[in-house]
Interface confidence: low
Amino acid sequence: QRFAQAQQQLPLESLGWDVAELQLNHTGPQQDPRLYWQGGPALGRSFLHGPELDKGQLRIHRDGIYMVHIQVTLAICSSTTASRHHPTTLAVGICSPASRSISLLRLSFHQGCTIASQRLTPLARGDTLCTNLTGTLLPSRNTDETFFGVQWVRP
Amino acid sequence: QRFAQAQQQLPLESLGWDVAELQLNHTGPQQDPRLYWQGGPALGRSFLHGPELDKGQLRIHRDGIYMVHIQVTLAICSSTTASRHHPTTLAVGICSPASRSISLLRLSFHQGCTIASQRLTPLARGDTLCTNLTGTLLPSRNTDETFFGVQWVRP
Amino acid sequence: QRFAQAQQQLPLESLGWDVAELQLNHTGPQQDPRLYWQGGPALGRSFLHGPELDKGQLRIHRDGIYMVHIQVTLAICSSTTASRHHPTTLAVGICSPASRSISLLRLSFHQGCTIASQRLTPLARGDTLCTNLTGTLLPSRNTDETFFGVQWVRP
């Protein structure tokens, strides 16, 4: 579908430009596979412009298509550690509202200690994204090794 | 923070749209872990629109939040080669000005021969990005295997 | 090069915003290494806004610089399977028109079961992108494990 008449002028606000880049705060308690994120200039190079954090999970404030990206590095890890503790899997998904729950992106570590990926996906205001790390290995909290972000791309 | 009044019209220039995609030129001399990049239509599909190269390193010309991405493939590599020469690590960071020096993104190869990742990060005019490859293995110069780029996302 | 006088107003249409995110439909017949893609709201979270599918391959409708991204996960795979069936390689390239045929992005699986990467590249109206998976292993059709997309970034 085309977006409007060719000459419609674009208000800056309507560009959306919602964007967030988060760093790992902590892992969940036993039986909770979720990673808990934090963001803000005081923490370093993480930030939230539009989206918000709700108990460490990222909540979307603007409908649109987003580029979602993530990198997670396992701490105290070698290729043998990774294969020994296989399967260690990371999944990014919409976890609330429950009616929209779905896995968006999933990767296993196999013999590697880092996974990194990205994808385009439609998200709606109120969608909360959860990142589930299953397995016995812990993620690194180094800000250049583990991060999670979204970027609004278009309506 | 919201960007302006909802109806403010957006000049094309202010979109920024600074973008660059680079291909590997060469590695540094002994004791210099940096990769040296090149870009321009004459070289193939690499380009610089806004950012510039300074002695093979990428210098930013416009403040903003950028998506930084990289893929590096090791040459003459198998999973046993990669594990044998472990640790081989790639780090992307701001290397100048020194006051802003920081590692932005870091990955190890472990038993793989390619790393690829991306992240959002604030960059300022004058920031120079360096990509450090530590270890004894050499990167492939094939333009579809090793590349490095940035894309301005928002102010 | 700069894009226009600083105060030129930007029509919404000229933003381009062409974007697509596809899910795997099927692999090709014997001797055809191409992956065949599908997209549309009825299929889940895949979509095409601007680009089109031509016999399962993605055709570009607007000139510009695009961010191309892909993730492919091998089905029924472990790190031992992946290394045993090595080399399994994924390549994304322009496959038509023939005069513009080129490989844009290439990765091998080595001991991993998932590859994911992204890059910026200039594409022209009419360019068709093909994704070739060479080797004996089959890709997963799970929509959170295997996907392919493009995002228009700038003219």
């Epitope: 070698s78 290729s79 043998t80 296989h86 | - | 790190s79 045993r84």
Partner: antibody, heavy 118, light 110 residues
Framework: QVQLQQWGAGLLKPSETLSLTCAVY????????WSWIRQPPGKGLEWIGE???????NYNPSLKSRVTISVDTSKNQFSLKLSSVTAADTAVYYC????????????WGQGTMVTVSS | QSALTQPASVSGSPGQSLTISCTGT?????????VSWYQQHPGKAPKLMIY???IRPSGVSNRFSGSKSGNTASLTISGLQAADEADYYC??????????FGGGTKVTVL
């Protein structure tokens, strides 16, 4: 064709230290883990431990306090030391290559019979 | 770490099929596909017959096959031959990063 050749003392007294060496011929040394496995007479196989070219080790918890596995990459060799031996340590000791790409011991040495007797 | 559990002996006539079970736990056989099987003739070193649960190395007869269900792996020998008479051991990688063998099964060809 990769081959493993092993040697070491075959007769020990209780409380002495067992010492065996295994040499790797005809293939990559650094791309694998290398293990020691033993088999008491008439009994089953027991994994002792493993090492890689950089010296990373994993040991059987039941033997860990007495076992040392070391590596000499310049000679493509790895060695086993088992301290404070008793008659229960009497066994055929094998060295083997651990193929991480196969999750198995794919190449074995010929075995060395070690007897502990006073 | 406890050894994997195998029957002490199984037997069969030439041409028949027989199956050896190997029972572990959710920390070894149940969690990984790193299950392998070894054949050992008297006075010889063990020989790898099956790895990754069901994969045969080159040179191993296709009469040998492997499978796994839950915490139990199985080795099946079809078209039993006199040369198959030997001891058979299963092996698994464990969650703690170690390897564990089964107690062994003596196969007798009647």
């Amino acid at each position: 064709q990769v081959q493993l050749q092993q040697w070491g003392a075959g007769l020990l007294k209780p409380s002495e230290t067992l010492s065996l060496t295994c040499a790797v011929y005809g293939g990559s040394f650094s791309g694998y883990y290398w293990s020691w496995i033993r088999q008491p007479p008439g009994k089953g196989l027991e994994w002792i431990g493993e090492i890689n070219h950089s010296g990373s080790t994993n040991y059987n918890p039941s033997l860990k306090s007495r076992v040392t596995i070391s590596v000499d990459t310049s000679k493509n060799q790895f060695s086993l030391k088992l301290s404070s031996v008793t008659a229960a340590d009497t066994a055929v000791y094998y060295c083997a290559r651990v193929s991480r790409s196969r999750g198995a011991f794919d190449i074995w040495g010929q075995g060395t019979m070690v007897t502990v007797s006073s | 770490q406890s050894a994997l559990t195998q029957p002490a002996s199984v037997s069969g006539s030439p041409g028949q099929s027989l199956t050896i079970s190997c029972t572990g736990t959710s920390s070894d056989v149940g969690v990984y596909n790193y299950v392998s099987w070894y054949q050992q003739h008297p006075g010889k070193a063990p020989k790898l017959m099956i790895y990754d649960v069901g994969i045969r190395p080159s040179g191993v007869s296709n009469r040998f096959s492997g499978s796994k269900s839950g915490n139990t792996a199985s080795l099946t020998i079809s078209g039993l031959q006199a040369a198959d008479e030997a001891d058979y051991y299963c092996n698994s990688y464990t969650r703690s990063g170690t390897w564990v063998f089964g107690g062994g099964t003596k196969v007798t060809v009647l």
